[in-house]
Amino acid sequence: ALDAAYCFRNVQDNCCLRPLYIDFKRDLGWKWIHEPKGYNANFCAGACPYLWSSDTQHSRVLSLYNTINPEASASPCCVSQDLEPLTILYYIGKTPKIEQLSNMIVKSCKCS
Amino acid sequence: ALDAAYCFRNVQDNCCLRPLYIDFKRDLGWKWIHEPKGYNANFCAGACPYLWSSDTQHSRVLSLYNTINPEASASPCCVSQDLEPLTILYYIGKTPKIEQLSNMIVKSCKCS
Protein backbone atom coordinates (compact mmCIF):
# COMPACT_ATOMS: atom_id res chain seq x y z
CA ALA A 1 0.00 0.00 0.00
CA LEU A 2 1.20 3.52 -0.79
CA ASP A 3 0.86 4.55 2.85
CA ALA A 4 3.12 6.16 5.47
CA ALA A 5 4.70 2.83 6.39
CA TYR A 6 5.99 2.49 2.83
CA CYS A 7 6.23 6.03 1.49
CA PHE A 8 7.80 7.82 4.44
CA ARG A 9 10.55 5.18 4.61
CA ASN A 10 11.44 5.17 0.93
CA VAL A 11 12.58 7.95 -1.39
CA GLN A 12 9.95 7.50 -4.06
CA ASP A 13 9.45 9.62 -7.18
CA ASN A 14 6.39 7.60 -8.15
CA CYS A 15 2.93 8.14 -6.69
CA CYS A 16 3.19 8.01 -2.92
CA LEU A 17 1.89 9.58 0.28
CA ARG A 18 3.71 12.83 1.11
CA PRO A 19 3.79 14.51 4.53
CA LEU A 20 1.95 17.82 4.75
CA TYR A 21 1.23 19.71 7.95
CA ILE A 22 -1.55 22.24 7.62
CA ASP A 23 -1.79 25.13 10.09
CA PHE A 24 -5.44 26.14 10.12
CA LYS A 25 -4.82 29.83 10.71
CA ARG A 26 -1.76 30.35 8.52
CA ASP A 27 -2.49 27.95 5.64
CA LEU A 28 -6.26 28.06 5.37
CA GLY A 29 -7.23 31.30 7.10
CA TRP A 30 -9.50 29.32 9.44
CA LYS A 31 -9.25 31.25 12.71
CA TRP A 32 -12.22 29.64 14.39
CA ILE A 33 -10.78 26.22 15.19
CA HIS A 34 -9.59 26.16 18.79
CA GLU A 35 -7.95 22.74 18.79
CA PRO A 36 -5.90 21.43 17.15
CA LYS A 37 -3.91 24.36 15.76
CA GLY A 38 -3.12 22.26 12.73
CA TYR A 39 -2.87 18.65 11.61
CA ASN A 40 -1.00 16.21 9.40
CA ALA A 41 -3.21 16.28 6.31
CA ASN A 42 -0.68 14.63 3.99
CA PHE A 43 -1.18 14.55 0.23
CA CYS A 44 -0.55 12.33 -2.77
CA ALA A 45 1.96 13.11 -5.48
CA GLY A 46 4.32 11.46 -7.91
CA ALA A 47 4.37 9.80 -11.29
CA CYS A 48 2.01 7.01 -12.27
CA PRO A 49 4.11 4.81 -14.53
CA TYR A 50 2.99 1.51 -16.01
CA LEU A 51 1.07 -0.52 -13.41
CA TRP A 52 2.16 1.56 -10.42
CA SER A 53 -0.71 0.94 -7.99
CA SER A 54 -3.40 1.23 -10.66
CA ASP A 55 -6.83 1.71 -9.21
CA THR A 56 -9.26 0.65 -11.94
CA GLN A 57 -9.28 -1.23 -15.20
CA HIS A 58 -9.36 2.15 -16.96
CA SER A 59 -6.25 3.40 -15.15
CA ARG A 60 -4.45 0.16 -16.05
CA VAL A 61 -5.48 0.62 -19.68
CA LEU A 62 -4.38 4.25 -19.54
CA SER A 63 -0.97 3.38 -18.10
CA LEU A 64 -0.48 0.75 -20.81
CA TYR A 65 -1.64 3.23 -23.47
CA ASN A 66 0.84 5.75 -22.09
CA THR A 67 3.65 3.18 -22.22
CA ILE A 68 2.98 2.38 -25.86
CA ASN A 69 2.20 6.03 -26.74
CA PRO A 70 4.65 7.96 -24.52
CA GLU A 71 3.96 11.26 -26.31
CA ALA A 72 0.30 11.11 -25.26
CA SER A 73 -0.96 13.44 -22.52
CA ALA A 74 -3.42 10.85 -21.21
CA SER A 75 -2.02 9.28 -18.07
CA PRO A 76 -3.28 8.26 -14.63
CA CYS A 77 -2.88 10.65 -11.71
CA CYS A 78 -1.79 10.14 -8.09
CA VAL A 79 -4.71 10.72 -5.73
CA SER A 80 -5.91 9.85 -2.25
CA GLN A 81 -7.25 6.38 -1.57
CA ASP A 82 -7.96 5.98 2.15
CA LEU A 83 -9.00 9.02 4.16
CA GLU A 84 -9.63 9.48 7.86
CA PRO A 85 -11.60 12.04 9.84
CA LEU A 86 -10.18 14.74 12.12
CA THR A 87 -11.78 15.73 15.41
CA ILE A 88 -11.78 19.47 16.09
CA LEU A 89 -12.86 21.71 18.95
CA TYR A 90 -14.38 25.13 18.36
CA TYR A 91 -16.68 27.51 20.22
CA ILE A 92 -20.15 28.57 19.30
CA GLY A 93 -20.67 31.49 21.66
CA LYS A 94 -19.27 30.23 24.97
CA THR A 95 -20.22 26.66 24.17
CA PRO A 96 -17.40 24.30 23.19
CA LYS A 97 -18.34 22.10 20.29
CA ILE A 98 -16.51 18.92 19.31
CA GLU A 99 -16.97 17.92 15.70
CA GLN A 100 -15.58 15.24 13.47
CA LEU A 101 -14.64 16.47 10.00
CA SER A 102 -14.75 13.58 7.57
CA ASN A 103 -12.10 12.81 4.94
CA MET A 104 -9.52 15.25 6.25
CA ILE A 105 -6.42 13.07 6.51
CA VAL A 106 -4.98 11.09 3.62
CA LYS A 107 -3.68 7.69 4.72
CA SER A 108 -2.80 6.14 1.36
CA CYS A 109 -2.64 6.88 -2.36
CA LYS A 110 -3.43 5.27 -5.72
CA CYS A 111 -3.04 5.95 -9.42
CA SER A 112 -6.46 6.67 -10.88
CA ALA B 1 -21.09 17.23 -13.69
CA LEU B 2 -17.79 17.12 -15.54
CA ASP B 3 -19.18 14.78 -18.16
CA ALA B 4 -19.41 14.70 -21.96
CA ALA B 5 -22.54 16.86 -21.98
CA TYR B 6 -20.61 19.67 -20.31
CA CYS B 7 -16.96 19.06 -21.24
CA PHE B 8 -17.28 18.23 -24.93
CA ARG B 9 -19.35 21.39 -25.51
CA ASN B 10 -17.08 23.81 -23.66
CA VAL B 11 -13.41 24.67 -24.12
CA GLN B 12 -12.26 23.99 -20.61
CA ASP B 13 -8.70 24.20 -19.23
CA ASN B 14 -9.90 23.04 -15.82
CA CYS B 15 -10.50 19.41 -14.91
CA CYS B 16 -12.85 17.91 -17.45
CA LEU B 17 -13.61 14.78 -19.43
CA ARG B 18 -11.44 14.52 -22.57
CA PRO B 19 -12.18 12.31 -25.58
CA LEU B 20 -9.79 9.39 -26.15
CA TYR B 21 -10.29 6.58 -28.62
CA ILE B 22 -8.22 3.47 -27.92
CA ASP B 23 -7.49 1.00 -30.71
CA PHE B 24 -6.89 -2.35 -28.98
CA LYS B 25 -4.29 -3.62 -31.43
CA ARG B 26 -2.39 -0.39 -32.10
CA ASP B 27 -2.58 1.30 -28.70
CA LEU B 28 -2.52 -1.61 -26.27
CA GLY B 29 -1.03 -4.49 -28.25
CA TRP B 30 -4.19 -6.56 -27.55
CA LYS B 31 -4.54 -8.55 -30.76
CA TRP B 32 -7.03 -11.10 -29.46
CA ILE B 33 -10.16 -8.95 -29.15
CA HIS B 34 -12.42 -9.63 -32.13
CA GLU B 35 -15.01 -6.92 -31.50
CA PRO B 36 -14.94 -4.00 -31.02
CA LYS B 37 -11.65 -3.00 -32.70
CA GLY B 38 -11.42 -0.12 -30.25
CA TYR B 39 -13.55 2.09 -28.02
CA ASN B 40 -14.05 5.57 -26.60
CA ALA B 41 -12.21 5.22 -23.31
CA ASN B 42 -11.98 8.97 -22.58
CA PHE B 43 -9.77 10.37 -19.81
CA CYS B 44 -9.68 13.17 -17.25
CA ALA B 45 -7.30 16.10 -17.39
CA GLY B 46 -7.06 19.75 -16.48
CA ALA B 47 -6.33 22.05 -13.57
CA CYS B 48 -8.04 21.74 -10.21
CA PRO B 49 -8.36 25.31 -8.93
CA TYR B 50 -10.06 26.27 -5.69
CA LEU B 51 -13.38 24.43 -5.33
CA TRP B 52 -13.50 23.16 -8.91
CA SER B 53 -15.55 19.98 -8.52
CA SER B 54 -13.76 18.97 -5.31
CA ASP B 55 -14.41 15.39 -4.36
CA THR B 56 -13.67 15.22 -0.63
CA GLN B 57 -13.12 17.53 2.31
CA HIS B 58 -9.39 16.87 1.92
CA SER B 59 -9.38 17.97 -1.73
CA ARG B 60 -11.27 21.12 -0.76
CA VAL B 61 -8.73 21.82 1.98
CA LEU B 62 -5.89 21.11 -0.45
CA SER B 63 -7.24 23.46 -3.11
CA LEU B 64 -7.63 26.19 -0.47
CA TYR B 65 -4.11 25.51 0.83
CA ASN B 66 -2.85 25.76 -2.75
CA THR B 67 -4.62 29.09 -3.24
CA ILE B 68 -3.00 30.57 -0.14
CA ASN B 69 0.34 28.82 -0.80
CA PRO B 70 0.61 28.94 -4.60
CA GLU B 71 4.26 27.84 -4.55
CA ALA B 72 3.30 24.57 -2.88
CA SER B 73 3.33 21.36 -4.91
CA ALA B 74 0.34 19.95 -3.03
CA SER B 75 -2.76 20.24 -5.15
CA PRO B 76 -5.76 18.11 -6.12
CA CYS B 77 -5.67 16.12 -9.34
CA CYS B 78 -8.24 15.54 -12.07
CA VAL B 79 -9.34 11.89 -12.09
CA SER B 80 -12.21 9.68 -13.20
CA GLN B 81 -15.43 9.66 -11.21
CA ASP B 82 -18.03 7.54 -12.99
CA LEU B 83 -16.90 4.58 -15.05
CA GLU B 84 -18.81 2.17 -17.26
CA PRO B 85 -18.10 -1.33 -18.53
CA LEU B 86 -17.31 -2.37 -22.08
CA THR B 87 -18.57 -5.56 -23.72
CA ILE B 88 -16.04 -7.41 -25.88
CA LEU B 89 -16.12 -10.48 -28.10
CA TYR B 90 -13.15 -12.82 -28.45
CA TYR B 91 -12.54 -16.43 -29.35
CA ILE B 92 -11.25 -19.21 -27.16
CA GLY B 93 -10.60 -21.92 -29.66
CA LYS B 94 -13.62 -21.86 -31.96
CA THR B 95 -15.92 -20.72 -29.20
CA PRO B 96 -16.95 -17.04 -29.24
CA LYS B 97 -16.87 -15.55 -25.76
CA ILE B 98 -18.69 -12.37 -24.79
CA GLU B 99 -17.26 -10.68 -21.73
CA GLN B 100 -18.00 -7.47 -19.89
CA LEU B 101 -14.87 -5.63 -18.81
CA SER B 102 -15.65 -3.41 -15.83
CA ASN B 103 -14.52 0.20 -15.40
CA MET B 104 -13.26 0.66 -18.96
CA ILE B 105 -15.02 3.89 -20.00
CA VAL B 106 -14.76 7.19 -18.11
CA LYS B 107 -18.05 9.06 -18.06
CA SER B 108 -17.20 11.94 -15.70
CA CYS B 109 -14.34 13.49 -13.74
CA LYS B 110 -13.61 15.07 -10.35
CA CYS B 111 -10.81 16.83 -8.52
CA SER B 112 -9.48 14.51 -5.84
Epitope: - | L28, G29, W32
Partner: antibody
Framework: QVQLQQPGAELVKPGASVKMSCKAS????????ITWVKQRPGQGLEWIGD????????NYNEKFKTKASLTVDTSSSTANMQLSSLTSEDSAVYSC????????????WGQGTSVTVSS | DVVMTQTPLSLPVSLGDQASISCRSS???????????LHWYLQKPGQSPKLLIY???NRFSGVPDRFSGSGSGTDFTLKISRVEAEDLGVYFC?????????FGSGTKLEIK
Protein backbone atom coordinates in the same frame (compact mmCIF):
# COMPACT_ATOMS: atom_id res chain seq x y z
CA GLN C 1 14.82 -10.44 -22.43
CA VAL C 2 11.52 -12.17 -21.68
CA GLN C 3 11.64 -14.18 -18.45
CA LEU C 4 9.04 -16.14 -16.51
CA GLN C 5 10.44 -17.08 -13.12
CA GLN C 6 8.89 -19.92 -11.13
CA PRO C 7 9.94 -21.48 -7.83
CA GLY C 8 11.69 -24.82 -8.35
CA ALA C 9 9.71 -27.16 -6.11
CA GLU C 10 6.82 -27.49 -3.66
CA LEU C 11 6.18 -30.38 -1.27
CA VAL C 12 2.58 -30.56 -0.05
CA LYS C 13 0.38 -32.95 1.89
CA PRO C 14 -2.64 -34.73 0.39
CA GLY C 15 -5.83 -32.68 0.76
CA ALA C 16 -3.92 -29.43 1.11
CA SER C 17 -3.64 -26.53 -1.34
CA VAL C 18 -0.65 -24.97 -3.01
CA LYS C 19 -0.24 -21.55 -4.61
CA MET C 20 2.57 -21.18 -7.10
CA SER C 21 3.85 -17.99 -8.69
CA CYS C 22 5.16 -16.95 -12.07
CA LYS C 23 6.99 -13.61 -12.12
CA ALA C 24 7.19 -12.00 -15.54
CA SER C 25 9.84 -9.57 -16.72
CA UNK C 26 11.26 -8.19 -19.95
CA UNK C 27 7.92 -7.40 -21.58
CA UNK C 28 4.63 -5.56 -21.04
CA UNK C 29 2.81 -7.87 -18.63
CA UNK C 30 -0.70 -6.65 -19.45
CA UNK C 31 -0.35 -7.19 -23.21
CA UNK C 32 0.07 -10.98 -23.09
CA UNK C 33 -1.97 -13.89 -21.78
CA ILE C 34 -0.45 -16.25 -19.24
CA THR C 35 -1.18 -19.93 -19.78
CA TRP C 36 -0.57 -22.80 -17.34
CA VAL C 37 0.40 -26.32 -18.38
CA LYS C 38 0.77 -29.57 -16.42
CA GLN C 39 3.48 -32.04 -17.35
CA ARG C 40 3.76 -35.54 -15.86
CA PRO C 41 6.45 -38.01 -16.89
CA GLY C 42 5.01 -40.30 -19.54
CA GLN C 43 1.70 -38.38 -19.62
CA GLY C 44 2.61 -35.50 -21.93
CA LEU C 45 1.42 -31.91 -21.56
CA GLU C 46 -2.03 -30.78 -20.42
CA TRP C 47 -3.47 -27.29 -20.77
CA ILE C 48 -4.93 -26.06 -17.46
CA GLY C 49 -6.12 -22.59 -18.38
CA ASP C 50 -5.29 -19.02 -19.38
CA UNK C 51 -5.51 -15.62 -17.73
CA UNK C 52 -5.14 -12.16 -19.25
CA UNK C 53 -3.45 -9.77 -16.79
CA UNK C 54 -4.79 -6.76 -18.68
CA UNK C 55 -8.40 -7.52 -17.77
CA UNK C 56 -8.37 -10.52 -15.43
CA UNK C 57 -10.22 -12.60 -18.06
CA UNK C 58 -9.83 -16.36 -17.52
CA ASN C 59 -10.47 -19.53 -19.50
CA TYR C 60 -10.17 -23.01 -18.00
CA ASN C 61 -9.93 -26.56 -19.24
CA GLU C 62 -13.16 -28.14 -17.86
CA LYS C 63 -11.02 -30.91 -16.35
CA PHE C 64 -9.23 -28.39 -14.10
CA LYS C 65 -12.10 -25.99 -13.35
CA THR C 66 -12.54 -27.17 -9.77
CA LYS C 67 -8.86 -27.93 -9.25
CA ALA C 68 -7.10 -24.75 -10.39
CA SER C 69 -7.68 -21.06 -9.75
CA LEU C 70 -5.75 -18.47 -11.76
CA THR C 71 -5.06 -14.93 -10.56
CA VAL C 72 -2.67 -12.09 -11.32
CA ASP C 73 -1.06 -9.28 -9.36
CA THR C 74 -0.35 -6.64 -11.98
CA SER C 75 1.59 -4.40 -9.59
CA SER C 76 4.28 -7.07 -9.27
CA SER C 77 3.82 -8.57 -12.78
CA THR C 78 3.09 -11.93 -11.20
CA ALA C 79 0.64 -14.65 -12.23
CA ASN C 80 -0.47 -17.20 -9.64
CA MET C 81 -2.10 -20.60 -9.78
CA GLN C 82 -3.71 -22.22 -6.77
CA LEU C 83 -4.35 -25.96 -6.79
CA SER C 84 -6.74 -27.33 -4.18
CA SER C 85 -7.61 -30.72 -2.63
CA LEU C 86 -4.33 -32.20 -3.78
CA THR C 87 -3.87 -35.90 -4.45
CA SER C 88 -0.96 -37.93 -5.82
CA GLU C 89 -2.46 -37.39 -9.31
CA ASP C 90 -1.55 -33.72 -8.94
CA SER C 91 2.16 -34.48 -8.55
CA ALA C 92 3.65 -32.95 -11.70
CA VAL C 93 5.64 -30.06 -13.11
CA TYR C 94 3.48 -26.98 -13.62
CA SER C 95 4.72 -24.40 -16.11
CA CYS C 96 3.50 -20.93 -16.88
CA UNK C 97 4.00 -19.45 -20.32
CA UNK C 98 2.92 -16.39 -22.25
CA UNK C 99 1.01 -15.90 -25.49
CA UNK C 100 -0.53 -12.99 -27.39
CA UNK C 101 -4.09 -14.32 -27.30
CA UNK C 102 -6.13 -17.36 -26.31
CA UNK C 103 -5.60 -19.05 -29.69
CA UNK C 104 -2.01 -17.95 -30.16
CA UNK C 105 1.05 -20.16 -29.74
CA UNK C 106 2.97 -19.97 -26.48
CA UNK C 107 6.20 -18.15 -27.28
CA UNK C 108 8.04 -18.20 -23.92
CA TRP C 109 7.85 -20.67 -21.04
CA GLY C 110 8.83 -20.63 -17.39
CA GLN C 111 11.11 -23.37 -16.04
CA GLY C 112 8.21 -24.99 -14.18
CA THR C 113 7.46 -25.74 -10.53
CA SER C 114 7.69 -29.37 -9.49
CA VAL C 115 4.84 -30.21 -7.11
CA THR C 116 5.10 -33.38 -5.03
CA VAL C 117 2.03 -34.48 -3.09
CA SER C 118 3.09 -36.77 -0.28
CA SER C 119 2.28 -37.39 3.35
CA ASP D 1 -11.15 -33.40 -26.75
CA VAL D 2 -9.02 -33.24 -29.90
CA VAL D 3 -6.45 -36.03 -29.80
CA MET D 4 -3.04 -35.20 -31.27
CA THR D 5 -1.21 -38.34 -32.43
CA GLN D 6 2.49 -37.99 -33.10
CA THR D 7 4.61 -40.47 -35.04
CA PRO D 8 7.14 -41.83 -34.59
CA LEU D 9 7.62 -41.86 -30.80
CA SER D 10 11.37 -42.08 -31.34
CA LEU D 11 13.35 -40.95 -34.36
CA PRO D 12 17.02 -41.99 -34.56
CA VAL D 13 18.94 -39.87 -37.10
CA SER D 14 22.48 -39.18 -38.19
CA LEU D 15 23.73 -35.59 -38.02
CA GLY D 16 23.19 -33.90 -41.39
CA ASP D 17 20.21 -36.12 -42.26
CA GLN D 18 16.68 -34.88 -42.93
CA ALA D 19 14.14 -35.66 -40.21
CA SER D 20 10.38 -35.68 -40.57
CA ILE D 21 7.85 -35.81 -37.71
CA SER D 22 4.15 -36.37 -38.26
CA CYS D 23 1.23 -35.08 -36.19
CA ARG D 24 -2.38 -36.04 -36.83
CA SER D 25 -5.42 -34.43 -35.19
CA SER D 26 -8.74 -36.17 -34.55
CA UNK D 27 -10.61 -33.10 -35.91
CA UNK D 28 -9.80 -30.43 -38.48
CA UNK D 29 -7.74 -27.60 -37.03
CA UNK D 30 -8.91 -25.02 -39.56
CA UNK D 31 -10.53 -22.16 -37.61
CA UNK D 32 -13.54 -20.28 -38.95
CA UNK D 33 -11.16 -17.31 -39.44
CA UNK D 34 -9.13 -19.43 -41.85
CA UNK D 35 -6.11 -19.86 -39.58
CA UNK D 36 -4.79 -23.29 -38.62
CA UNK D 37 -3.68 -23.10 -35.00
CA LEU D 38 -1.13 -25.91 -35.08
CA HIS D 39 2.22 -25.25 -33.41
CA TRP D 40 5.52 -27.12 -32.91
CA TYR D 41 7.83 -27.03 -29.88
CA LEU D 42 11.21 -28.53 -28.96
CA GLN D 43 11.94 -29.53 -25.38
CA LYS D 44 15.50 -30.37 -24.41
CA PRO D 45 16.24 -32.37 -21.23
CA GLY D 46 15.86 -30.23 -18.10
CA GLN D 47 14.64 -27.23 -20.11
CA SER D 48 11.29 -25.68 -20.85
CA PRO D 49 9.85 -26.05 -24.38
CA LYS D 50 10.88 -23.62 -27.11
CA LEU D 51 8.52 -22.48 -29.86
CA LEU D 52 9.67 -23.46 -33.36
CA ILE D 53 6.66 -23.11 -35.68
CA TYR D 54 3.35 -21.34 -35.06
CA UNK D 55 0.10 -21.35 -37.05
CA UNK D 56 1.10 -24.31 -39.21
CA UNK D 57 4.10 -22.94 -41.09
CA ASN D 58 5.42 -19.72 -39.53
CA ARG D 59 8.92 -19.89 -38.09
CA PHE D 60 9.30 -18.18 -34.70
CA SER D 61 12.00 -15.49 -34.49
CA GLY D 62 15.50 -16.92 -34.20
CA VAL D 63 14.49 -20.38 -35.43
CA PRO D 64 16.85 -21.59 -38.20
CA ASP D 65 15.37 -22.00 -41.68
CA ARG D 66 16.19 -25.71 -41.66
CA PHE D 67 12.92 -26.08 -39.71
CA SER D 68 9.69 -26.01 -41.71
CA GLY D 69 6.06 -26.83 -40.97
CA SER D 70 3.40 -27.95 -43.42
CA GLY D 71 0.09 -29.77 -43.67
CA SER D 72 -3.61 -29.03 -43.73
CA GLY D 73 -6.81 -29.96 -41.93
CA THR D 74 -5.77 -32.96 -39.83
CA ASP D 75 -2.32 -34.01 -41.11
CA PHE D 76 0.78 -32.02 -40.26
CA THR D 77 4.52 -32.43 -40.69
CA LEU D 78 7.60 -30.84 -39.14
CA LYS D 79 10.73 -31.19 -41.29
CA ILE D 80 14.34 -30.56 -40.28
CA SER D 81 16.40 -30.42 -43.46
CA ARG D 82 19.84 -31.07 -41.93
CA VAL D 83 19.83 -32.26 -38.32
CA GLU D 84 22.39 -30.63 -36.03
CA ALA D 85 23.42 -31.73 -32.53
CA GLU D 86 21.50 -28.84 -30.96
CA ASP D 87 18.26 -30.14 -32.53
CA LEU D 88 18.13 -33.24 -30.32
CA GLY D 89 15.29 -33.45 -27.84
CA VAL D 90 11.55 -34.06 -27.70
CA TYR D 91 9.31 -32.41 -30.31
CA PHE D 92 5.66 -31.64 -29.47
CA CYS D 93 2.83 -30.53 -31.69
CA UNK D 94 0.00 -28.55 -30.12
CA UNK D 95 -3.39 -27.24 -31.26
CA UNK D 96 -5.30 -24.16 -30.10
CA UNK D 97 -8.26 -24.31 -32.49
CA UNK D 98 -10.47 -26.33 -30.14
CA UNK D 99 -10.99 -26.10 -26.38
CA UNK D 100 -9.40 -27.69 -24.46
CA UNK D 101 -6.09 -26.99 -26.15
CA UNK D 102 -4.16 -30.24 -26.51
CA PHE D 103 -0.63 -31.50 -27.16
CA GLY D 104 0.89 -34.44 -28.93
CA SER D 105 2.69 -37.05 -26.81
CA GLY D 106 6.08 -36.08 -28.23
CA THR D 107 8.71 -37.46 -30.62
CA LYS D 108 12.22 -38.02 -29.32
CA LEU D 109 14.87 -37.07 -31.88
CA GLU D 110 18.10 -38.90 -31.03
CA ILE D 111 21.41 -39.84 -32.60
CA LYS D 112 21.48 -43.14 -34.48
Amino acid sequence: QVQLQQPGAELVKPGASVKMSCKASGYIFTSYWITWVKQRPGQGLEWIGDIFPGTGSTNYNEKFKTKASLTVDTSSSTANMQLSSLTSEDSAVYSCARKLGPNYAVDYWGQGTSVTVSS
Amino acid sequence: DVVMTQTPLSLPVSLGDQASISCRSSQSLIHSHGNTYLHWYLQKPGQSPKLLIYKLSNRFSGVPDRFSGSGSGTDFTLKISRVEAEDLGVYFCSQSTHVPFTFGSGTKLEIK
